[in-house]
Interface confidence: low
């Protein structure tokens, strides 16, 4: 007889890919716009990534560090109008990209929680949440949480009234902490948050340093659903140097849990290679002309545009692993195995009963290094086979598809491998 | 209501140059980009090119890239277009127009101000 | 530079029957073409602006379709105040060009 199926866990839908954070809608659509109204025309881009929900704003009116000239029931004309804002998230829904709001307060201000005025700003959160709950939102995102003073209980509060409305929203919290501490003591409370964190952003050293940081997570919050990101807004580029950028795609989307990009993640988009431009927000590359402020500062190859035309750039390989991400089973939800696969390397293997098995190996370091597979650290359940397909390597030339022997598996620097192979009974 | 109201008629004589404005009223004037277009009876509608103007930024028609000039003036909702060097080819209506994003078409034209090149 | 053809320089209709004004890119355009209406001695007004998105406030007598390189503008029971200019734009790439219009006329 054959084996009994293992019964799928309940998935919600940031379950099942991707977050795109659109912080600046002006930096992100350039050229002059910056509303809603033009956000609703980048839809479809959004969907060509795969993204399952769009983290957006503030939109809200905030006069800088002013509380009381501070609503977060209303959308800064700058931004748009109401009916804007039900446009977008309508044509949102019809392309089943859900759409999460931030609402931190005083974004434009010192202190994003106005310090001295915690229970006036934490009653306009809880009418904002209500509000909008009503008006379609799928979730909300609140940022700089350390610098809200009993944050813990004020989440756990928002956590009820979200979930209160619908099982299916989701409130996800920003920290600058990079402490695992700090971290814990925040989820401790909050069963379902999302949290996103400084945690990873100093793991570009070794392949040793990532492994364990991310096993030491992954072992602490226990069976709890998780997100992975380098920080709670910034760009991939502020943390990381680009030839760790997509081996760093790879991890984030082949790791249990919720990857979290920001917009320009997906094609490196570096505020460092445009000189005058805000580092936290700089203005999204779509084609050449999108930053004209120093002729031929900008190459084909920065863009969206560019990328799009070219299967071996950072946007096709992040197309690849989004669509790869949410429709195979064992990336979905699958168990999480690392194992030792030699100094610089992190490996581990991703599995779902009966499902194809994915084997992930990342060289961090900028050698070539030969794997030496560690099979005996893995489960009976996990097992590796001799061989494995090649699904895609974050590096050109290699022929996808062909089948690799684990034993004789080498790496060129700074290389990621997603390797298939099938359940074996 | 959305306004793009343009500066009136200009006649002036070859050689010299001209500036012409357009101000906009009834929204948020960085929020859209302005387009500048020129008709003339020989060629239809020509694009001479686009400006930011929330960053400032300008995209030519090669065509018009030492002919044209445009520029905002961020402060009066206001932007402008100059013409260099005229000649009697360059008599035409131009016309301002805005658009919300880069991917889409303009939506708004003003009234059109009238160059006529003529010694 | 994509070269925006309207073959038709005129078209002569009656009140309340339907025409088609067609536009034919020299490469493929995907569907960013715009559709403009001008009147003597005013600025065009925009119908479309993005195949098939009409413009706020256009009445649903002006359909458009197309995608690549072929664009129609169909107006169907036609009024006297449609009797204009129409022109076509394409918007997909630097420079945005224009087709030379056809201009809609009573029989």
């Known amino acids: 007889r054959a084996p009994r199926c293992r019964e799928l866990p309940a998935q919600k839908w940031w379950h099942t890919g991707a977050l795109y954070r659109i912080g600046d809608l002006q930096a992100f659509q350039g050229h002059g716009a910056g509303n809603l109204a033009g956000l609703k025309g980048r839809l479809d881009y959004l969907s060509s990534l795969k993204v399952k929900g769009l983290v957006l704003g503030p939109i809200h009116k905030n006069q800088k560090d002013d509380v009381a000239q501070t609503d977060l029931l209303q959308i800064d004309p700058n931004f748009g109008s109401k009916e804007d804002f039900d446009s977008l998230l309508q044509s949102a829904k019809k392309k089943s990209i859900r759409v999460i709001l931030d609402l931190t307060p005083n974004y434009r201000g010192e202190n994003s929680w106005f310090s001295t005025q915690v229970d006036t700003v934490a009653t306009k959160v809880k009418d904002a949440l209500e509000f909008w709950l009503q008006a379609g939102v799928d979730g909300f995102q609140v940022r700089d949480i350390e610098n809200l003073k009993d944050a813990s209980s004020f989440l756990a509060e928002w956590q009820n009234i979200t979930k209160g409305f619908s099982e299916d929203r989701l409130l996800i919290a920003g920290t600058n902490s990079s402490d695992l501490q700090q971290i814990l003591s925040l989820l401790e409370s909050n069963k379902d948050l999302l949290l996103t964190s400084s945690y990873l952003s100093d793991s570009g050293s070794t392949g040793e340093h990532t492994k364990s940081l991310v096993t030491q997570y992954l072992n602490a919050t226990g069976n709890r659903w998780c997100s992975w990101s380098l920080s709670q807004a910034r760009l991939l580029t502020s943390f990381l140097p680009a030839q760790l950028l997509r081996l760093y795609q790879l991890m984030l989307f082949t790791l249990p849990g919720t990857p979290v990009f920001s917009y320009g993640d997906e094609i490196g988009l570096d505020a460092a290679a445009l000189p005058g431009q805000p580092m936290e927000a700089p203005v999204m590359l779509w084609d050449e002309s999108s930053f004209p402020d120093i002729p031929g500062a900008v190459s084909a190859n920065m863009t969206v545009k560019g990328q799009s035309e070219d299967p071996g750039s950072l946007l096709s390989l992040f197309r690849r692993l989004s669509d790869q991400r949410s429709k195979e089973r064992s990336l979905l939800h699958g168990d999480f195995h690392a194992f030792s696969a030699g100094p610089g390397l992190f490996s581990y293997i991703r599995h779902w009963d009966q499902n194809e098995r994915f084997l992930v190996v990342l060289n961090f370091g900028d050698v070539g290094l030969s794997a030496g597979l560690q099979a005996s650290d893995l489960p009976a359940s996990a097992s590796l086979p001799a061989k494995a397909d090649l699904l895609l390597s974050t590096q050109p030339g290699r022929e996808e598809g062909s089948p690799l022997e684990l034993e004789r598996l080498k790496l060129e620097p700074h290389e990621g491998l997603l390797l298939r192979f099938p359940y074996a009974a | 209501q959305v306004q793009l109201q343009q500066s009136g008629a200009e006649l002036v004589r070859p050689g010299v140059s001209v500036k012409i404005s357009c101000k906009a009223s009834g929204y948020t004037f960085t929020d859209y980009a302005m387009h500048w277009v020129k008709q003339s009876h020989a060629k239809s509608l020509e694009w001479i090119g686009v400006?930011?103007?929330?960053?400032?930024?300008?995209t030519y028609n090669q065509k018009f890239k030492d002919k044209a000039t445009m520029t905002v003036d961020k402060s009066s909702s206001t932007a402008y277009l100059e013409l260099a060097r005229l000649t009697s080819e360059d008599s035409a209506i131009y016309y301002c127009?805005?658009?919300?994003?880069?991917?889409?078409?303009?939506?708004?034209w003003g009234q059109g101000t009238s160059v006529t090149v003529s010694s | 530079d994509i070269v925006m053809t309207q073959s038709q320089r005129f078209m002569s209709t009656s009140v309340g029957d339907g025409v088609r004004i067609t536009c034919k890119a020299s490469?493929?355009?995907?569907?960013?073409v715009a559709w403009y209406q001008q009147k003597p001695g005013q600025s065009p007004k925009a119908l479309i602006n993005?195949?098939?998105n009409r413009h706020t406030g256009v009445p649903d007598r002006f359909t458009a379709r197309g995608s690549g390189t072929d664009f129609t503008l169909t107006i169907s029971n036609v009024q006297s105040e449609d009797l204009a200019d129409y022109f076509c734009l394409q918007h997909w790439n630097y420079p945005l060009t224009f087709g030379a219009g056809t201009k809609l006329e009573l029989k």
């Open positions: 993005l195949a098939p």
């Open positions: 490469q493929n355009v995907r569907t960013a």
């Open positions: 127009a805005r658009v919300w994003l880069l991917s889409y078409a303009m939506d708004n």
């Open positions: 400006i930011s103007t929330y960053y400032g930024d300008t």
